[in-house]
């Protein structure tokens, strides 16, 4: 189920998954959540003189068990991912950080007026991911009231520095609060030939747009659907970016479909899951475990209830069903995504709701627990 | 056998192939000798096929293609299935064949020890599964007979993977959990050996298993210890010491 | 000897419900799975619906989901097809049947080797 | 689902005669397949089950074979009891399907 609470100078042994920098705990914690294995994350606030540079480091862990041996370690802060909370679970970050430089690749620098301006405008440009400002005190003069807009491969800053004057925070594109507006087309038999960012496998376009949403770098998207040609490239979902942040004309291509990020939508973002149920399809993974249901739709509760589980497959074969009902396979892989699609299976395939806002879950207040 | 390699001649000396005479003639099942006048293989061969003239039953042969009309091949006299087996249950999946003429037995052709009942809680660990089966669901019968070594499993976890079906303590479980390594068609009634103090003994029958060599879906064989009063009693009523028995 | 009796078929109007009953006998009843198979006149088998041997999982066939529920009294050797919103599309001799599940060819194999003699149900107005 | 397809739909054929009906499923079935007989007014009889293995007490004129796609049954020698109707079964996934039959009359 839900777990908030919060574990205070307290670190989590072992797990590790991924490191990243992020600016509190919270930021952590929401990182955790969307990352398609991460359970745990333990996050350094405080750290000794002699590692710096591991202050705000942002530890993501998983565990088979769903927990880990927890250390006493002053100034760490760890805790639980919120993957099943239902409407806790948000992309969306409004805090700003003052006396913190979010470190990354600084793309463009502007002059406004203040911290709000600069927000707007990170959350107004194609590759902004977070942002710097420098107010009037700043020690540097040619800096002062200067908005730097930031990316990084990772979408989180590359790395955190206390600096006086310096105030930063996180693009708003995911609080649906972007004017660029969003390109709901979707282009059948064509493909665009920009640079990829990353590839996934997905069973249609409408996953692969979904995924592409939420990725931090993908602006737009090819997927090949089950008939193209090339068999390594069938059901794979090629997520994309252009300098410009706009795709190149895109080129006619049979079983090809193609189409654009939903992050600068305000009204029609889906939400970070896939809710629909594919007939005759499976989706091959690692197995999680198997457990015998009566009918697909309780075999995608029982992934979703079950915190590791990403997607599963329900078996009509005889041989499949038991006197509980079919076979319910919950799998798991790196991305979260199927490692392979295949066609023509007895029975059907799907994902967890576990990231859906509308999975009910009970209510839970975040615990501060000093340990 | 998936996920087996070729056996040598004179390797699996007990191993029979079953066939069948009808148009043609084709390997069916596999069998183990266990006495000159005795083999003994799975009920569920004779399904739809219970008559002893049409079986033809080949020993001391590695290659199927050995098999000319000339290769002699021992006929069935009596055919002995199980009283409680039902076609529709697949339990008790176990059967004597008694042949007509007794065998000679050679280097390539000889019996395989029977288990004694004390040896129902055996822990064995070298164990080989043989036969001309499938080497993968949707293949074909092998030319030369195959061998595979599979761990056996517990009854237990046995029947957590086979959830509809009763695991009974008279059958006993065989597979990797990864799958890869099993019987399959063709090698049904054919020997699981296992070597124990020194000798092979015949510890199972091979009967059923769910597809060949699946991940976390053993194969399920006749644990022949469970069956040795039934067997002593089938084959002594026709003659004394007509076994080779491990206490023998 | 195996038998199936089926009963409960007759003449009932569309929107109406009816039940049918599958008494068995001469195997244990409570060991095998059973099905409904039903053959609109002078048309081809078209299976109904399925259950455990002890009635914790069904399976039913699209054209009856919601309408139709299979059930069984294993201390009564009976089976049971209640049919509600009957159609005239759902005229036709229902048959109970016996699944089998063998062994063949190293396989566990399912097959309905023993029917009832069938029960006509007709929808009309 | 899976579609069973049955050729032909009617057969002529005289005492003695070889006959052969052919089922084809839309997508493999491995063996998971079954014939059975039906005469006007009674229930369907099994005779194959697992594409090739007789029923016990089927006459043993009656074979099976095939198995993926591609299935057939055979009568060896046509007997006046076996003028009926023949449907195949997938027994491989839910929802179990039949084919539409084989009707075989006397020529």
């Known amino acids: 189920g839900c777990m908030t609470q919060l574990y205070k100078n307290t670190f989590f042994r072992g797990g590790d998954l991924a490191a990243i920098y992020t600016p509190d705990a919270q930021y952590c914690q929401k990182m955790c959540t969307f990352h398609p294995r991460c359970l745990l994350f333990s996050f350094l606030a405080v750290t000794p003189p002699k590692e710096t540079n591991k202050r705000f480091g942002c530890f993501m862990k998983e565990s088979i068990t769903g927990t880990l041996p927890r250390i006493h370690r002053t100034g760490a802060i760890s805790g639980h991912s919120l993957k099943q909370c239902g409407h806790q679970i948000s992309a969306c970050h409004r805090d700003i950080y003052k006396g913190l430089d979010m470190r990354g690749s600084n793309f463009n620098i502007s002059k406004t007026d203040n911290i709000e301006e600069c927000q707007k405008l990170c959350t107004n440009n194609f590759h902004c991911q977070f942002f710097t400002y420098a107010t009037s005190a700043f020690y540097r003069p040619e800096y002062r009231k200067k908005c730097l807009l930031k990316h990084s491969a990772s979408g989180t800053p590359t790395s955190i520095k206390s600096a006086d004057n310096l105030v930063s925070g996180f693009s708003l594109k995911s609080c649906a609060l972007s004017e660029i507006g969003c390109p709901m087309d979707i282009f059948q038999h064509s493909a665009f030939a920009d640079l990829n960012v990353s590839q996934v496998i997905t069973p249609d376009a409408f996953v692969c747009r979904t995924i592409c949403t939420f990725h931090p770098n993908c602006l737009f998207f090819t997927f090949y659907t089950n008939e193209w040609e090339t068999e390594s490239q069938r059901n794979v979902c090629f997520l994309k970016t252009s300098k410009s942040g706009r795709p190149s004309p895109p080129i006619p291509q049979e079983n090809a479909i193609s189409g654009y990020s939903l992050l600068t939508c305000r009204k029609t973002r889906p939400e970070p899951c896939h809710s629909k149920i594919y007939s005759g399809v499976d989706f091959e993974g690692e197995e999680l475990n198997v457990t015998f249901v009566q009918g697909a739709d309780v075999c995608q509760e029982t992934c979703t209830k079950t915190i590791r589980c990403q997607f599963f497959i329900y078996s009509l074969l005889p041989q499949d069903c038991k006197e509980e009902g079919c076979k319910c396979s919950l799998r798991l892989s790196t991305d979260g995504s199927p490692t392979r699609i295949t066609y023509g299976m007895q029975g059907s395939s799907g994902y967890s709701l576990r990231l859906c806002k509308l999975v009910d879950s009970p209510d839970c207040t975040t615990k501060i627990n000093a340990r | 056998i998936v996920g087996g390699t070729n056996a040598s001649l004179g390797e699996w000396p007990w191993q029979v192939s079953l066939q069948v005479k009808l148009v043609s003639q084709t390997h069916l099942c596999g069998g183990s000798i266990i006495g000159r006048q005795w083999v003994l293989t799975a009920a569920h061969c004779f399904d739809g096929i219970p008559y002893p003239d049409v079986w033809r039953i080949y020993g001391g042969i590695l290659s199927l293609s050995e098999i000319t009309k000339e290769t002699p091949s021992s006929r069935i006299k009596e055919l002995i299935i199980h009283q409680e087996y039902k076609v529709s249950e697949g339990n008790y999946d176990i059967a004597l064949i008694k042949l007509q003429t007794p065998l000679n037995y050679t280097e390539f052709q000889k019996p395989i020890c029977l288990p004694s009942k004390a040896d129902t809680n055996t822990i064995y660990t070298n164990c080989w599964v043989t036969g001309w089966g499938y080497t993968k669901e949707q293949g074909e019968t092998q030319n030369i007979l195959q061998k595979a070594t599979i761990p056996l499993v517990p009854n237990e976890e046995c029947q957590k993977k086979y959830r509809d079906y009763v695991i009974n303590k008279q059958m006993i479980c065989a597979g990797y959990k990864e799958g890869g390594t099993d019987a399959c068609k063709g090698d049904s009634g054919g020997p699981l050996v296992c070597k124990h103090s020194g000798r092979w003994q015949l510890v199972g029958i091979t009967s059923w298993g769910e597809g060949c060599g699946r991940k976390d879906q053993p194969g399920v064989y006749t644990k022949v210890s469970e069956y040795m009063d039934w067997i002593l009693e089938k084959t002594q009523s026709s003659d004394v010491r007509a076994l080779e028995t491990s206490s023998a | 000897e195996v038998q199936l009796l089926e009963s409960g078929g007759g003449l009932v109007q569309p929107g109406g419900s009816l039940r049918l009953s599958c008494a068995a006998s001469?195997?244990?009843?409570?060991?095998?799975?059973m099905t409904w198979v039903r053959q609109a006149p002078g048309k081809g088998l078209e299976w109904v619906s399925y259950?455990?041997?002890?009635?914790?999982?069904?399976i039913y066939a699209d054209s009856v989901k919601g309408r139709f529920t299979i059930s069984r009294d294993n201390s009564k050797n009976t089976l049971y097809l209640q049919m509600n919103s009957l159609r005239a599309e759902d005229t036709a001799v229902y048959y109970c049947?016996?699944?089998?599940?063998?062994?063949?060819?190293?396989?566990?194999?399912?097959?309905?080797?023993?029917w009832g003699q069938g029960t006509l149900v007709t929808v009309s107005s | 689902d899976i579609q069973m397809t049955q050729s032909p739909s009617f057969l002529s054929a005289s005492v003695g005669d070889r006959v052969t009906i052919t089922c084809r499923a839309s997508?493999?079935?491995?063996?998971?397949l079954a014939w059975y007989q039906q005469k006007p007014g009674k229930a369907p009889k099994l005779l194959i089950y697992?594409?090739?293995t007789l029923q016990s007490g089927v006459p043993s004129r009656f074979s099976g074979s095939g198995s993926g796609t591609e299935f057939t049954l055979t009568i060896s020698s046509l007997q006046p009891e076996d003028f009926a109707t023949y449907y195949c079964?997938?027994?491989?996934?839910?929802?179990?399907?039949f084919g539409g039959g084989t009707k075989v009359e006397i020529k």
């Open positions: 997508q493999g079935i491995s063996s998971y």
């Open positions: 001469g195997f244990t009843f409570s060991h095998y799975l």
């Open positions: 697992a594409a090739s």
């Open positions: 079964q997938q027994l491989n996934s839910y929802p179990l399907t």
């Open positions: 259950i455990s041997p002890s009635g914790g999982h069904t």
């Open positions: 049947a016996r699944v089998a599940r063998g062994i063949a060819a190293r396989s566990r194999t399912s097959y309905f080797d023993y």
